[in-house]
């Protein structure tokens, strides 16, 4: 079996302030089992945007139903974008661990740019 890859097909996305950003991410394998998380930025200071396993993320919706059998689409939408949301977003696959899940592989990132609303 080929090792799972995390595909973020869009290097960059431009969204007008107040609109919804769609950040695309798919994985190429059902193996290993484990959740997806989305982060803004990289390294220890990265900001968690969405965690499939747990948490409350009122601005985020998933494009696909995460409970759908054999789901490999982990794209998200972020509503009511503001300039403060600009940055690079990473889709990160975790593998099931005991007791904690373990980071497995990251996508290449998608840079979100925000266009100011015309005044």
């Amino acid at each position: 079996e080929e090792e799972l890859q995390v595909i973020q097909p869009d290097k960059s996305v431009l969204v007008a302030a107040g609109e919804t950003a769609t950040l695309r991410c798919t994985v190429t394998s059902l193996i290993p089992v484990g959740p997806i998380q989305w982060f803004r930025g990289a390294g220890p200071g990265r900001e968690l945007i969405y965690n499939q396993k747990e948490g409350h993320f009122p601005r985020v919706t998933t494009v696909s139903d995460s409970t759908k059998r054999n789901n490999m689409d982990f794209s998200i939408r972020i509503g009511n974008i503001t300039p403060a949301d600009a940055g690079t977003y990473y889709c990160v696959k975790f593998r099931k661990g005991s007791p904690d899940d373990v980071e497995f592989k990251s996508g290449a990132g998608t840079e979100l740019s925000v266009r100011a609303k015309p005044s």
Partner: antibody, heavy 119, light 110 residues
């Protein structure tokens, strides 16, 4: 840490109904299927049914479709299975189990509820 | 429904030796390159524990002495070298369609 809490025992009269509970914690309840499995004393495992807590979609083993009814309460992160018209053949341990990979498998299990049907 | 037949129903294996358990499906449980077979271990008074998913992938925390193989209709769980704590009943399960379990194999350590 994923946990599925089930009451230890239920004693019920023949012909009555019982509603078994499975309280989930440590993960987003609506993101993962819940399965129910029956095990009679000294016997093997029988899959009863599964429910998607996000929209209450259910799939039943045909053998149990007139016996078991699955529901969820999203406000309390609890899955329920009601068993009706109980007979001695329904005396068993009933497990709930969570499907972490959307593969229709059972990754995390509750400790089970022992149901005894006796007059 | 797909029926899973496990064999043997019970076996006794000496400490340090190999235990081999078979699971045969009444029709193929493979689809899109995946084999939808799972293996569980159950000890008395405990719930089952997932060991192997999609036929050959070890679940987290499962010792490497456990391995799974097979495709289509014929699958095998191997334990080598067997340890005392491996005494348990082992079940296969498929999810090619709605799930069903095999009848179980009781492993005794000699």
């Amino acid at each position: 840490q994923v946990q599925l809490q089930q009451p230890g025992t239920e004693l019920v009269r023949p012909g009555a109904s019982v509603k078994l509970s499975c309280k989930a914690s440590g993960y987003t309840f609506t993101n993962y299927w819940i399965n129910w499995v029956k095990q009679r004393p000294g016997q093997g495992l029988e899959w009863i049914a599964m429910i998607d807590p996000s929209d209450s979609e259910t799939h039943y083993n045909q053998i149990f479709k007139d016996k078991a009814t699955l529901t969820v309460d999203k406000s309390s992160n609890t899955a329920y299975m009601q068993l009706s018209s109980l007979t001695s053949g329904d005396s068993a341990v009933y497990y709930c189990a969570m499907d972490y990979g959307s593969l229709y498998a059972m990754d995390y299990w509750g400790r089970g509820t022992s149901v005894t049907v006796s007059s | 429904d797909i029926v899973l037949t496990q064999s043997p129903a019970s076996l006794a294996v000496s400490l340090g030796q190999r235990a081999t358990i078979s699971c045969r499906a009444s029709k193929s449980v493979s689809s899109s390159g995946y084999n939808y077979i799972f293996w569980y271990q159950q000890k008395p008074g405990q719930p089952p524990k997932l060991l192997i998913y999609l036929a050959s992938n070890l679940d987290s925390g499962v010792p490497a002495r456990f391995s799974g193989s097979g495709s289509g209709t014929d699958f095998t769980l191997n334990i080598h070298p067997v340890e005392e704590e491996d005494a348990a009943t082992y079940y296969c399960q498929h999810s090619r369609e709605l799930p069903t379990f095999g009848g179980g194999t009781k492993l005794e350590i000699k």
